[in-house]
C-alpha cells in the first residue's frame, strides 16, 4: 500500500536507502512488507502513504530503522484492518467502491460490506 | 443506551469561529460513523457533515467545505464540529446524530448556535 | 444535490385516522430513505430505514414504502401522540438530503 501512492515522497527509494546505511545492523530492514492481503480505497491509501513517509523521515532524521518491523507489524495487525473496515462499510461505502491491491495497486469494483459484517452487534 | 449529548453552542459575532462537541455513551464509539445535522429557525434540516469510524473520511456539503470541520476523539468518545467564518445563515440547532448501515439511528438533543451581531 | 420533495407540508387529521405522507426524489436513491419523528421538544427518533424496515421499539402501525420514486409513510390509526413534524432523509449519496418535513395536526 505504502509504495502505490504519493511518488514524489519516493518512499521504496528512501527506504532502500536506509536499510543499506543500516545493513549490517538490519538485516530484515530492506524486506519488502507483504500487504497482499489487503485492498484500500484512495483515501485511505494516501493516508497510509503519508504516515509512512512522517515515520521515515523519523527515522532519517534519528538514522535508525530499528522501529521499522514494529510500525509494519502495526500497519498488518491494526491499522490495515481498520482502514478496509471503513472502506467497505458506511458512510464511505454504499453498493459498490473501487479498491486498491495493496501489492499490486490495481483497482477493482467491489461489493461493500453486508450490515452483520460492519456492525456485528445490529 | 445510547446517549449523545451536544454542547458548545453560543452567540457569537458574524466572522466568529465556534467548536461543538457531543459526549457519546452507550455504545462502542469507535465502532460507528457519525454526523451533524443542523435545523434552521423554519425548521428545515440541513446536513452538515459525517466522519467515518477512526476519522479516515470525512464528508461535507460543498456550501460549508473549507469552514467546517468534524473530527472525532474516540479515545474521548467525542465528535466535535469546528465552525469558522460563522455568518447569520448558519443560525439553527446542530444535533450530533450516529451512523449505522442506514445513515443516522440516533440523535442528540442538539446545541443552539447563533450568528448575530 | 438529490432533492426531496416532501408532500403535504401539513396535514390535519383525526385521532384514529389512516394518513400517509410522501416524499417524491429527484434521482434514483434505491431504498436508501429513512423517514424521522421530530417531537415539539426537538427530540428526533429514526421511525422507519431503508424505504420499509421498522426501527425497534416503533409501534406497528407505521409502514414505509415506495413507488417508483415516491416513498410512503403511512400511520394506520392515528394516535394522539403521533401529532407530531415528520421528515424524510436520502442517504444514497453524499450530500444527504432531507424532505421540507410534514406537520401532522389534530383536527
Known amino acids: 500500500c505504502v509504495f502505490c501512492r504519493l511518488p514524489a515522497h519516493d518512499l521504496s527509494g528512501r527506504l532502500a536507502r536506509l536499510c543499506s546505511q543500516m545493513e549490517a545492523r538490519q538485516k530484515e530492514c530492506g524486506a519488502s512488507p507483504d500487504f497482499s492481503a489487503f485492498a484500500l480505497d484512495e483515501v485511505s491509501m494516501n493516508k497510509v502513504t503519508e504516515k509512512t513517509h512522517r515515520v521515515l523521515r523519523v527515522m532519517e532524521i534519528k538514522e535508525a530503522v530499528s522501529s521499522l518491523p514494529s510500525y509494519w507489524s502495526w500497519l498488518r495487525k491494526t491499522k490495515l484492518p481498520e482502514y478496509t473496515r471503513e472502506a467497505l462499510c458506511p458512510p464511505a461505502c454504499r453498493g459498490s467502491t473501487t479498491l486498491y491491491n495493496c501489492s499490486t495497486c490495481k483497482g477493482t469494483e467491489v461489493s461493500c460490506w453486508p450490515r452483520k459484517r460492519c456492525f456485528p452487534g445490529s | 443506551e445510547v446517549q449523545l449529548v451536544e454542547s458548545g453552542g453560543d452567540l457569537v459575532k458574524p466572522g466568529g469561529s465556534l467548536k461543538l462537541s457531543c459526549a457519546a455513551s452507550?455504545?462502542?464509539?469507535?465502532?460507528?460513523?457519525m454526523s451533524w445535522v443542523r435545523q434552521t429557525p423554519d425548521k428545515r434540516l440541513e446536513w452538515v457533515a459525517t466522519?467515518?469510524?477512526?476519522?479516515?473520511?470525512?464528508y461535507y456539503p460543498d456550501i460549508l467545505k473549507g469552514r467546517f470541520t468534524i473530527s472525532r476523539e474516540n479515545a474521548k468518545n467525542t465528535l466535535y464540529l469546528q465552525m469558522s467564518s460563522l455568518k447569520s445563515e448558519d443560525t439553527a440547532m446542530y444535533f450530533c446524530a450516529r451512523e449505522d448501515y442506514d445513515a443516522m439511528d440516533y440523535w442528540g438533543q442538539g446545541t443552539s448556535v447563533t450568528v448575530s451581531s | 444535490d438529490i432533492q426531496m420533495t416532501q408532500s403535504p407540508s401539513s396535514l390535519s387529521a383525526s385521532l384514529g385516522e389512516r394518513v400517509s405522507l410522501t416524499c417524491r426524489a429527484s434521482?434514483?436513491?434505491?431504498?436508501?430513505l429513512n423517514w424521522l419523528q421530530q417531537e415539539p421538544d426537538g427530540t428526533i427518533k429514526r421511525l422507519i430505514y431503508?424505504?420499509?424496515s421498522l426501527d425497534s421499539g416503533v409501534p406497528k402501525r407505521f409502514s414505509g414504502s415506495r413507488s417508483g420514486s415516491d416513498y410512503s409513510l403511512t400511520i394506520s390509526s392515528l394516535e394522539s401522540e403521533d401529532f407530531v413534524d415528520y421528515y424524510c432523509?436520502?442517504?444514497?449519496?453524499?450530500?444527504?438530503?432531507f424532505g421540507g418535513g410534514t406537520k401532522l395536526e389534530i383536527k
Open positions: 452507550g455504545f462502542t464509539f469507535s465502532t460507528y460513523g
Open positions: 466522519i467515518s469510524f477512526y476519522g479516515t473520511h470525512t
Open positions: 432523509l436520502q442517504y444514497a449519496i453524499f450530500p444527504y438530503t
Open positions: 431503508a424505504t420499509s
Open positions: 434521482q434514483d436513491i434505491g431504498s436508501n
